[in-house]
């Protein structure tokens, strides 16, 4: 199979093979027509919703018979519903007082727009990236990171928050998307799947990667997140896909080796400071960028997403540790913690490199590239 146009950049390598999505996000119904985040990851599309062959918003699954088959609801991790009477065994139980709609979850009720109306917005994340439709923008310069190489002290808080594993970052990590577009890193977290089921949030031509890292930043124009929510450019996220490689990733091992300590929902531990930039791809010059939203409630829009073209390699054992160690609400494993891809609704994804120029023999017909919106910057 042909590699999607995630370039095989050394040293960390590129994308792995994936199916072509026969329909672009632009053709999908708007978020208001069919908000999809209430669907469990992997749930089959409802009639009339998308019903497309090759739709890969959903995790790949090998049915027990090893034959091709559709994913059934019983294959999904069970999550204790609000109000379930049983007391979980792992001491991470449902809050009984204030059991309102704010306790959202992946793959079940309540529907996210009921939790936060912004989740039904038109410019949501994540999205499927189709490099052939990306607009090459020479104005998108290499990302600049300063202060990301942290000393061992002070230690950092690593927490299982029931939705992900989150590392809170100290002050002083500066990131620039370009001149005058300066940010401060706040925290990083991961999204993953389950055994044999990929769990990245963004996809490339319908291909879902094993996992994805998000480093969340606040614009220097704002003092606090609550001021920046929903403001264009107020928040920026650096995202990178995690793939399986032959060797252990020593940077990630500094975090993954501590996951056992925070297996229970709500638990936290202190980890020595580390080189945060080592968790990201080495090539800061090749990336995709678009404006979207937070991928969890309240789903606030105006978030600048920068998705690296280069991927990060972890060993099979490390990816297994990531997806098989933590517990979420009730007695459910913390797995498949990704939101389905959302319609672009006319948005154009920009690329800092000519991603649409396909040198492979498959590119028989001419490709119509979108124009670069940032050309006048």
């Amino acid at each position: 199979q042909r590699l999607p146009r995630m370039q095989e950049d050394s040293p960390l390598g590129g994308g792995s093979s994936g199916e072509d999505d026969p329909l672009g996000e632009e053709d999908l119904p708007s978020e208001e027509d069919s908000p999809r985040e209430e669907d469990p990851p992997g749930e089959e599309d409802l009639p009339g919703e998308e019903d497309l062959p090759g739709e890969e918003d959903l995790p790949e699954v090998k049915p027990k018979s090893e034959e091709e088959g559709s994913l059934k609801l019983e294959d999904l991790p069970t999550v204790e519903a609000p109000g379930d009477p049983q007391e979980p065994q792992n001491n991470a139980h449902r809050d009984k007082e204030g059991d309102d709609q704010s306790h959202w979850r992946y793959g079940g009720d309540p529907p996210w727009p009921r939790v936060s109306p912004a989740c039904a917005g038109r410019f949501q994340s994540p999205v499927d990236i189709r490099p052939q439709l990306a607009a090459f923008c020479p104005a998108l310069r290499p990302l600049e990171l300063l202060g990301f190489q942290l000393p061992p002290l002070p230690e950092l808080r690593l927490r299982n928050n029931g939705h992900s594993v989150q590392l809170t970052l100290p002050p002083g990590l500066e990131m620039a998307l370009g001149p005058g577009r300066e940010y401060r890193a706040l925290q990083l977290h991961l999204h993953w799947g389950a055994a044999g089921r990929p769990g990245s949030e963004h996809t490339v031509e319908g291909h879902r990667f094993p996992a994805e890292i998000h480093v969340v930043h606040l614009s220097t124009a704002f003092a606090r997140v609550d001021e920046a929510l929903g403001r264009p450019g107020g928040l920026a996220v650096l995202a990178a896909f995690l793939e399986e490689g032959p060797e252990e990733n020593s940077a990630y091992e500094q975090l993954l080796s501590r996951l056992e300590e925070i297996a229970e929902e709500g638990s936290e531990t202190q980890v020595p400071g580390l080189d945060i930039s080592a968790l990201l791809p080495s090539d800061f010059s090749r990336y995709f960028q678009y404006e979207g939203s937070l991928t969890t409630p309240p789903c606030a829009q105006g978030v600048i997403w920068t998705v690296f073209n280069q991927t990060v390699m972890l060993s099979a054992k490390q990816l297994h540790t990531l997806s098989d160690t933590l517990w979420g609400p009730g007695d459910s494993r913390l797995q498949l913690n990704f939101r389905a891809t959302q319609p672009l609704n006319g948005r154009v994804i920009e690329a800092s490199f000519p991603a649409g120029v396909d040198s492979s023999p498959r590119a028989a017909e001419p490709v119509q590239l979108n124009s670069c919106l940032a050309a006048g910057d």
């Epitope: 449902r94 306790h103 928050n161 925290q187 997140v225 609550d226 709500g266 409630p297 979420g328 609400p329």
Partner: nanobody, 117 residues
Framework: QVQLVESGGGLVQPGGSLRLSCSAS???????????VAWYRQAPGKGLELVSV???????KYSDSVKGRFTISRDNSKNTLYLQMNSLRAEDTAVYYC????????WGQGTLVTVSS
């Protein structure tokens, strides 16, 4: 601006009870209900210790030293976090801080709890 204001601290005898409250104001309506919220404490001459947390997913967790005696709860309609403390001991004496964690940490100014006869 999000402001977290703790209240309910004071002097109590061993075996007694207190209820701490942490009220969030300002833009907190945007974030409180989506945040993990927690109580930390700092005893004299000691480091910061996590007492209890309610995660954004709704689960609760307690440190071993308070399990069975303390109960954490939240009321998102009031943007308020609570900590019911029963069977208090001298070693519970500390400044208790409210923490709201939504992409970044928000902290209260702390309320002093003194357990002494």
């Amino acid at each position: 601006q999000v402001q977290l204001v703790e209240s309910g601290g004071g002097l109590v005898q061993p075996g007694g009870s207190l209820r701490l409250s942490c009220s969030a104001s300002g833009n907190s309506a945007n974030i409180f209900s989506f945040a993990s919220v927690a109580w930390y404490r700092q005893a004299p001459g000691k480091g910061l210790e996590l007492v209890s947390v309610i995660t954004s997913a709704g689960g609760t967790k307690y440190s071993d030293s308070v399990k069975g005696r303390f109960t954490i709860s939240r009321d998102n309609s009031k943007n308020t976090l609570y900590l019911q403390m029963n069977s208090l001991r001298a070693e519970d004496t500390a400044v208790y801080y409210c923490n709201v964690d939504y992409l970044q940490d928000y902290w209260g100014q702390g309320t002093l709890v003194t357990v002494s006869s």
